[in-house]
């Protein structure tokens, strides 16, 4: 039995990366720990070194292969273990049977760009990164726009219920600086969660033409 409260959470990016976080109350800060991945039906296994992210939390990325290679399928089950060094031996601190396509978190969308901007609207596009071809078009997106004087948390969420890698923002204020972010989630997976937000895209609406009602 492991002393204290332990939590071991991992997500698959749908291609060649499993990211894990392990938190353990009362764990020793100077102990060397790693995550070991052992698929049930593959010839390879993989290890990554857990690095501290807070007082009682460690994280690491299992790199399974080339970023766009399909290293696991929906039938695979991966045994994930947290192993910590105790003298000359490794002790199992946490273990889970991990179904990769039930625990998905995709990479943040990339390549955000302004396609067209006017006084009151702006058309923005983006791309998804390292997402499996398994999903076909069955992805959804959330987007948010940061207005002057507001925080990201206050920004209303816009939901796109299909694989649509663009958005037309309406009812914007002329000659105003905005920022825009988007995130993605597959429909597949009981424990699937949203990707991180993309890097913000800054844009400015065009000024209203003088003497004209726009």
């Amino acid at each position: 039995a492991v002393n204290g409260t332990s939590q071991f959470t991992c997500f698959y990016n749908s291609r060649a990366n499993i990211s894990c976080v392990w938190s353990q109350d009362g764990a020793l800060q100077d102990t060397s720990c790693q995550v070991h991945a052992w698929p049930d039906r593959r010839r390879w296994n993989q290890t990554c070194e857990l690095l501290p992210v807070s007082q009682a939390s460690w994280a690491c990325n299992l790199i399974l292969g080339a970023p766009d290679s399909q290293k696991l399928t929906t039938v695979d089950i991966v045994t994930l273990r947290v192993l910590c060094r105790e003298g000359v031996r490794w002790r199992v601190m946490a273990i889970q049977d991990f179904k990769p396509f039930e625990n998905l978190r995709l990479m943040a969308p990339i390549s955000l760009q302004v396609v067209h901007v006017e006084t009151h609207r702006c058309n923005i596009s983006w791309e998804i990164s390292q997402a499996s071809h398994y999903f076909e078009r069955h992805l959804e997106f959330e987007a948010r726009t940061l207005s002057p004087g507001h925080t990201w948390e206050e920004a209303p969420l816009l939901t796109l219920k299909q694989k649509q890698e663009w958005i037309c923002l309406e009812t914007l204020t002329p000659d105003t600086q905005y920022e825009f972010q988007v995130r993605v989630k597959p429909l597949q997976g009981e424990f699937t969660t949203w990707s991180p937000w993309s890097q913000p895209l800054a844009f400015r609406t065009k000024p209203a033409a003088l003497g004209k009602d726009t």
């Epitope: 290679s69 399909q70 399928t73 039930e102 071809h133 999903f135 076909e136």
Partner: antibody, heavy 117, light 107 residues
Framework: EVQLVQSGAEVKKPGATVKISCKVS????????MHWVQQAPGKGLEWMGW????????EYAPGFQDRVTITADTSTDTAYMELSSLRSEDTAVYYC??????????WGQGTTVTVSS | EIVMTQSPATLSVSPGERATLSCRAS??????LHWYQQKPGQAPRLLII???QSISGIPARFSGSGSGTEFTLTISSLQSEDFAVYFC?????????FGQGTKLEIK
């Protein structure tokens, strides 16, 4: 327009092998999963397996894995299903289909295979 | 192997009325449940994925619900073209398995 066109009906003797083709158009075959499903009169729909055309990996259902081989020719955008050691209970309609691993978005028209001595 | 049981085997409903088809899984499958329609002499057609998500191009009268082991396909107002066989399919445990089908016929 997505299309999956299967080869014609076959009549085979018990113990023989049948190979059905599925020619696709209207989508990128090289990043698709191609599936095969059996629909036998008394047994309903049974998933036989799939091939990932991106990397050639296959997955077979346990009930078929000893006798079925699924292949894909990316130069002609054609998937194949070969079923060996045929018996009378293999008399069925066989469908190819395209989809992610979890469900089947587009289907071929079906190929009837009759196994009879 | 997960066994999918559909009920009833045959359902007789008048055009314009509502039809409710049931599908039960032999173990918990979360929302990994999909519905198909098959007309005589044709291949099945995908209607609903993950229990409740409609496929684009499918009429809004088709809706799905349920999670865990009990699922329902509802057709709110039956049209003549809706009379067909309906199959459910699970994708929680390989091999994926289908129900035996519910035949929806004109009353």
């Amino acid at each position: 327009e997505v299309q999956l066109v299967q080869s014609g009906a076959e009549v085979k003797k018990p113990g023989a092998t049948v190979k059905i083709s599925c020619k696709v158009s209207g989508f990128n075959f090289k990043d698709s999963l191609m599936h095969w499903v059996q629909q036998a009169p008394g047994k309903g729909l049974e998933w036989m397996g799939w091939i990932d055309s991106e990397n050639g990996e296959t997955e077979y259902a346990p009930g078929f894995q000893d006798r079925v081989t699924i292949t894909a020719d990316t130069s002609t955008d054609t998937a194949y299903m070969e079923l060996s050691s045929l018996r009378s209970e293999d008399t069925a309609v066989y469908y190819c289909a395209r989809g992610g691993p979890w469900f089947l978005s587009y289907w071929g028209q079906g190929t009837t295979v009759t196994v009879s001595s | 192997e997960i066994v999918m049981t559909q009920s009833p085997a045959t359902l007789s409903v008048s055009p314009g009325e509502r039809a409710t088809l049931s599908c039960r899984a032999s173990q918990i499958i979360s929302n990994n449940l999909h519905w198909y329609q098959q007309k005589p002499g044709q291949a099945p057609r995908l209607l609903i994925i993950y229990g409740l998500q409609s496929i684009s191009g499918i009429p809004a009268r088709f809706s799905g619900s349920g999670s865990g082991t009990e699922f329902t396909l509802t057709i709110s107002s039956l049209q003549s073209e809706d009379f067909a066989v309906y199959f459910c399919q699970q994708s929680n445990n390989w091999p994926w398995t289908f129900g035996q089908g519910t035949k929806l016929e004109i009353k």
